[in-house]
Structure formats: structure tokens, C-alpha cells
Interface confidence: low
């Protein structure tokens, strides 16, 4: 028996369902009573889901997995993972045994889009050209870690005096806070771009300082 999986990682959004595709080529006369199908975590060998002794043994992993029972006899051994969490990310091995056996691993990449950044300014009043200000760009609930880029009003990248911190919250999603320290010109726009490298999703925020008032 030959097991086939997708070579590219499966990308799944947090809280959505993902299908980890796995297939084998059944011989003529194949019956499900012959099938031993095991899904396990590649690294730890923890059992995820199994089909043995002619029946679905159910989920051994978070009760969030399912097979496609009607398609098994056709050689479809794919695994459905429901309500994906950050901790589901990783490699899963599909192991198929009939008379002989084969296995293959598929990677699950979890992703979550970042929120539109919120911009804060410190100090936020009585600003004068030449003042040093701190602009903070905050974006929330993304995964994996973001790439953060700052630009001025002319689109020129600002790389100096930037400090970016990323903290995982209780769901493993990241909150990103990027701080730009800059000396004010007469007026100016400062833009922050938070990029999710897996989704290629860009979230933009900007602050424009034109004397008073400030516009965000």
C-alpha cells in the first residue's frame, strides 16, 4: 500500500476546521475490515485518531477529529480537525496498514489574522517640531509572529529607534506592540504595517501630526 499526502503545509485559520489529506490505493476486493489507519503526532507519537478492527475507534486527541467514513473504502484516509487551535500546529503522520503498510507526514500551519493596528502617541498634546515623541502601534490576536514595518509620509522606511515586542496570549495568539521614537518635523505621517507572514495579510495603521489636532 502506498500512502500519499500533500507536500505543502495545510494552512488553517484558528477556530476553523482543517482537512489533513491522506490517501492510499486500495487493491481490488479491499474491505474496511482489513484496514488499520492511525493518525498520530509525528514528534511525540501521540495517538490522534484511529480506524481498526473494521470500525472507527474515534478521536484520541481533543475530541475534535473525524475521518470521512464513507470515503475510506475508496482510499480516502483524510483527517478533519475541528476548531483549530495554535497548539494543533505541527506534523501529523498518516499510517495505513492493510496487508503491508506505509506512512507519510503532513504539516499543519496555523494562522490568525492580525487586527487593524491602534496607534497611540506620547506625549499627545503640546507637540512642537523638534520634540521627541513615542508612537506605539498595537495589533492583536494574530499568529504566527508578525513582521512590523514603519514608514514616514513619503513611504521611506523607518528602521532606527524601533522596538517591537510580541507576547502570546492565553490562546497562543500574539499581541504585537511596536514603538517608534522619532523627532517631529513640521508635520508628518507615520505608518505602521503589521504583516502576517503566513497569510501574507497586511494590517495598516497611521498617525498624522499636523500641528493640532492629531488624526489617527
Amino acid at each position: 500500500v502506498e500512502v500519499q499526502v500533500s507536500e505543502d503545509p495545510v494552512v488553517a485559520l484558528v477556530d476553523t476546521d482543517a482537512t489533513l489529506r491522506c490517501s492510499f490505493s486500495p487493491e481490488p476486493g479491499f474491505s474496511l475490515a482489513q484496514l488499520n489507519l492511525i493518525w498520530q503526532l509525528t514528534d511525540t507519537k501521540q495517538l490522534v485518531h484511529s480506524f481498526t478492527e473494521g470500525r472507527d475507534q474515534g478521536s484520541a486527541y481533543s475530541n475534535r477529529t473525524a475521518l470521512f467514513p464513507d470515503l475510506l473504502v475508496q482510499g480516502n484516509a483524510s483527517l478533519r480537525l475541528q476548531r483549530v487551535r495554535v497548539t494543533d500546529e505541527g506534523s501529523y503522520t498518516c499510517f495505513v496498514s492493510i496487508q503491508d503498510f506505509d506512512s507519510a507526514a503532513v504539516s499543519l500551519q496555523v494562522a490568525a489574522p492580525y487586527s487593524k493596528p491602534s496607534m497611540t502617541l506620547e506625549p499627545n498634546k503640546d507637540l512642537r517640531p523638534g520634540n521627541m515623541v513615542t508612537i506605539t502601534c498595537s495589533s492583536y490576536q494574530g499568529y504566527p509572529e508578525a513582521e512590523v514595518f514603519w514608514k514616514d509620509g513619503q513611504g521611506v522606511p523607518l528602521t532606527g529607534n524601533v522596538t517591537t515586542s510580541q507576547m502570546a496570549n492565553e490562546r497562543g495568539l500574539f499581541d504585537v506592540h511596536s514603538v517608534l521614537r522619532v523627532v517631529l518635523g513640521a508635520n508628518g505621517t507615520y505608518s505602521c504595517l503589521v504583516r502576517n507572514p503566513v497569510l501574507q495579510q497586511d494590517a495598516h495603521g497611521s498617525v498624522t501630526i499636523t500641528g493640532q489636532p492629531l488624526t489617527f
Epitope: S62, N63, R64, V86, T87, A168, E170, R171, G172
Partner: antibody, heavy 121, light 107 residues
């Protein structure tokens, strides 16, 4: 079936610290969150914080920030809650709780038996 | 922090009664609400999650409804085993917060 077994009751002096343990069995310890919830005598439930062992991340309620430390030892499937600078109002039953493998990190299907911490001079 | 306000704080009832306990959130929590039952000297027991989903093994006389800021727990026909305290808990945001509790006692 997840089981959570906590350490025994303790009596502590004001200003001291206490460390309560919670040993988990019957589930994949590292992949679920362990929360600590306390209940003062005759009072309601109060969430203190949680740890997600697989991520090594702890979160605390602001009220306890700086006084509570939640840790986990994956090798023994045990979570710990240490509360420092104890005062009389910390007298309570302390529970560890989690959602098990089948629920969320935010609701609690499984609870320890509770550990009574009495703070008294 | 999100404040959870339960009412009433005490409820006197008889076996067979239909009971409704209300929980109000200080801000919108969508459907991220759970209900627990607690008996004296015991740990709480999860009854309802996501406002209306019955936890496995919980009798169908318990039901939950609501979304946003207003939620209710209903017991259609009170049984002797149901005399206990009930707590709501929001899990929309950190910190997780509980309501003050409702004690259901025998009339």
C-alpha cells in the same frame, strides 16, 4: 477522563507564601490549560490565572499580578500556584481546573478537590 | 474587567418548579458564557457552555439562553438534586470573571 489531585490543606502566617500543587492524569497535560480559581468562605468564585504547559505561558488576573506565580512541570504533569504576601483575606479554598482535552481553555470541565488555605496569626 | 451580575442572589423553590436565573454582563460578551452548579463542600460542575450548549451528562431540564449582555439559566422542573448554588462565568476576555452566585434553597 481527566483527574486533578491537589495538595493538602495548610495554615499560614500573614506575610508568608504558600505553594499548592495540582497533579493531572488521564489526559494530555501539556496541551490543555490549568487555571486556578479560589473561593473565600461563603463567597463566590474568583479566577486567579492560568498556565498552558505546552506554551509555557501563564496569565494572571490583574488583582493577583505580582503576588501569584503559576508554573507547570510537564515531566510530572503537575501545575503549581504560589501566592505570596499572604493576608487574612486570602483564606479560601483554592481549586485547579481545566477544560480537559474535549473542551476549551476557558471553561472548566474538570476540577481538583480544592485546597483550603487558612491565613491566621 | 467585565462584571457579571447574577439575580436573584437567593431563590426559594419547591420540587417541580420552573426556575430562571439571570446573569448580566457589563459589556457585550457575545455567547461566551458558562453556567456552573456547586454544592456545599464540592467543586463546581460545568452545566452549560457557549451560553446554550449542554455539557455532556447534564440533564436536559437545564438549558441556557441569551447573548450579548443578558443570559438566563432555566431549570424546567426542579429536582431534589438541584438545590445548590449556580454561577455564571464569562470567557469573552481576560480576566475570566464569575457572577456572584445564586443559591437555590428549599421553600
Amino acid at each position: 477522563q481527566v483527574q486533578l489531585v491537589e495538595s493538602g490543606a495548610e495554615v499560614k502566617k500573614p506575610g508568608s507564601s504558600v505553594k499548592v500543587s495540582c497533579k493531572a492524569s488521564g489526559g494530555t497535560f501539556s496541551s490543555y490549560a490549568i487555571s486556578w480559581v479560589r473561593q473565600a468562605p461563603g463567597q463566590g468564585l474568583e479566577w486567579m490565572g492560568r498556565i498552558i504547559p505546552i506554551l509555557g505561558i501563564a496569565n494572571y488576573a490583574q488583582k493577583f499580578q505580582g503576588r501569584v506565580t503559576i508554573t507547570a512541570d510537564k515531566s510530572t504533569s503537575t501545575a503549581y500556584m504560589e501566592l505570596s504576601s499572604l493576608r487574612s483575606e486570602d483564606t479560601a479554598v483554592y481549586y485547579c481546573a481545566n477544560g480537559g482535552d474535549s473542551s476549551s481553555w476557558y471553561t472548566f470541565d474538570y476540577w481538583g478537590q480544592g485546597t483550603l488555605i487558612t491565613v491566621s496569626s | 474587567d467585565i462584571q457579571m451580575t447574577q439575580s436573584p442572589s437567593t431563590l426559594s423553590a419547591s420540587v417541580g418548579d420552573r426556575l430562571t436565573i439571570t446573569c448580566r454582563a457589563s459589556q457585550n460578551i457575545n455567547s461566551w458564557l458558562a453556567w456552573y452548579q456547586q454544592k456545599p463542600g464540592k467543586a463546581p460542575k460545568l452545566l452549560i457552555y457557549k451560553a446554550s450548549y449542554l455539557q455532556t451528562g447534564v440533564p436536559s431540564r437545564f438549558s441556557g439562553s441569551g447573548s450579548g449582555t443578558e443570559f438566563t439559566l432555566t431549570i424546567t422542573s426542579l429536582q431534589p438534586d438541584d438545590f445548590a448554588s449556580y454561577y455564571c462565568q464569562q470567557y469573552d476576555s481576560n480576566p475570566l470573571t464569575f457572577g456572584g452566585g445564586t443559591k437555590v434553597e428549599i421553600k
